[in-house]
């Protein structure tokens, strides 16, 4: 799987999950989140050659098409597969509120 | 929705479904399919700016990150959303066989 275990410990050039830290204030302009100040969101990057973690029948076809037509702009793209939630703390007035923001952290990628 | 109805009748620059015809023999090397000789597979292409048909909370965050960090390589990607099957006919010896190949045609796209 193109997950953090594999991708973070390798120098994989193809589609893989990459490290990305997002600072809520600086990178998103979200000033309302009290904790954490930012988080490791990660992102997906890298080419999707033939057979590289292809998601559907269509992505297999497109990767194969791409191999037969190398100049084509039609190619599968490296996108998130498994996403995880992020617990945050913010204030409603003086009252702290703990919430899970769903689908915030990329754990693995796929070619779609 | 970024579907064929909208995308094929517009000059949309952002993420949208685009026309692509695939010839089984020439483009995939699949010689065994008797009918059709090829099909309109389509593909997804175009930038994914902030708020453009974003798929998950994560893709919203990433698009926003991208807006704050325009030079970053982390950005959502335009990928298939709705896929449809393709009926084919091939011969097993002298006997024709009709089969549905699942997830072969892109009907709409999303930013993931």
């Amino acid at each position: 799987a193109l997950d953090t275990n594999y991708c973070f410990s390798s120098t994989e050039k193809n589609c893989c999950v990459r490290q990305l830290y997002i600072d809520f204030r600086k990178d998103l302009g979200w000033k309302w989140i009290h904790e954490p100040k930012g988080y490791h969101a990660n992102f997906c990057l890298g080419p999707c050659p033939y057979i590289w973690s292809l998601d559907t029948q269509y992505s297999k076809v497109l990767a194969l098409y791409n191999q037969h037509n190398p100049g084509a702009s039609a190619a599968p793209c490296c996108v998130p597969q498994a996403l995880e939630p992020l617990p945050i703390v913010y204030y409603v007035g003086r009252k702290p509120k703990v919430e899970q923001l769903s689908n915030m952290i990329v754990r693995s990628c796929k070619c779609s | 929705a970024l579907d064929t109805n909208y995308c094929f009748s517009s000059t949309e620059k952002n993420c949208c479904v685009r026309q692509l015809y695939i010839d089984f023999r020439k483009d995939l090397g699949w010689k065994w399919i008797h009918e059709p000789k090829g099909y309109h597979a389509n593909f997804c292409l175009g930038p994914c700016p902030y708020i453009w048909s974003l798929d998950t909370q994560y893709s919203k965050v990433l698009a926003l990150y991208n807006q704050h960090n325009p030079g970053a390589s982390a950005a959502p990607c335009c990928v298939p959303q709705a896929l449809e099957p393709l009926p084919i006919v091939y011969y097993v010896g002298r006997k024709p066989k009709v089969e549905q190949l699942s997830n072969m045609i892109v009907r709409s796209c999303k930013c993931s």
């Epitope: 057979i51 297999k60 194969l64 | 090397g29 065994w32 097993v92 010896g93 066989k97 089969e99």
Partner: antibody, heavy 121, light 111 residues
Framework: QVQLVQSGAEVKKPGASVKVSCKAS????????MNWVRQAPGQGLEWIGQ????????NYNEMFEGRATLTVDTSTSTAYMELSSLRSEDTAVYYC??????????????WGQGTLVTVSS | DIVLTQSPASLAVSPGQRATITCRAS??????????MNWYQQKPGQPPKPLIY???NLESGVPARFSGSGSRTDFTLTINPVEADDTANYYC?????????FGQGTKVEIK
């Protein structure tokens, strides 16, 4: 160059199942049908069935329908043949063999080295 | 299923001589202008090796000493001249109809 490398020999008890693997390299795995053929000791060759890796489309010899299951893992370019409810008559060398690409049923141009499956109580 | 009958079951040939193996199908294997008949060579402990496809087309890398002929139900594999390395079992196979079937094999020995 094209290579099909099969898993090692197996000894199974009657009634059990066996799963043989065939790892392909040197060609585009999802472009060719993969066939499975067996050969009982000192006997002729018998076609079990075939699978098209890109779609998972399968065709089986009626003799093996319901007992043989063909699958693939396209991420590792590996084909699998599982045979269930084994009996002593299933003792044979099992081969994977690539179809040459023109038709579904085709001449088989590359063969694995074979996997001996012995069914014995 | 189409039944393929090979003859002879075995034959011994001297080096430099001609070896002829015949394969008779229980029904025609011709279709789309082709004869769907293939020939394979198998040596002990090895997988079958393709020799001929579509009745008469030589697989790449196969010596021109091997040739195939025939149509409909009657087919022939000829090795001329035979060499010591040709000791093996030879199988015909039809792929005109599912399931593909094989002949029972012909054992060729070099005297």
């Amino acid at each position: 160059q094209v290579q099909l490398v099969q898993s090692g020999a197996e000894v199974k008890k009657p009634g059990a199942s066996v799963k043989v693997s065939c790892k392909a390299s040197g060609y585009i795995f999802i472009t060719y049908w993969m066939n499975w053929v067996r050969q009982a000791p000192g006997q002729g060759l018998e076609w079990i069935g075939q699978i098209f890796p890109a779609s998972g489309s399968t065709n089986y010899n009626e003799m093996f329908e319901g007992r043989a299951t063909l699958t693939v893992d396209t991420s590792t370019s590996t084909a699998y043949m599982e045979l269930s409810s084994l009996r002593s008559e299933d003792t044979a060398v099992y081969y994977c063999a690539r179809g040459d690409g023109n038709y579904a049923l085709d001449a088989m141009d590359y063969w694995g080295q074979g996997t001996l499956v012995t069914v014995s109580s | 299923d189409i039944v393929l009958t090979q003859s002879p079951a075995s034959l011994a040939v001297s080096p430099g001589q001609r070896a002829t193996i015949t394969c008779r199908a229980s029904e025609s294997v011709d279709n789309y202008g082709n004869s769907f008949m293939n020939w394979y060579q198998q040596k002990p402990g090895q997988p079958p090796k393709p020799l001929i496809y579509f009745a008469s087309n030589l697989e790449s890398g196969v010596p021109a000493r091997f040739s195939g002929s025939g149509s409909r139900t009657d087919f022939t594999l000829t090795i001329n001249p035979v060499e010591a390395d040709d000791t093996a079992n030879y199988y015909c196979q039809q792929n005109n109809e599912a399931p593909p079937t094989f002949g029972q094999g012909t054992k060729v020995e070099i005297k």
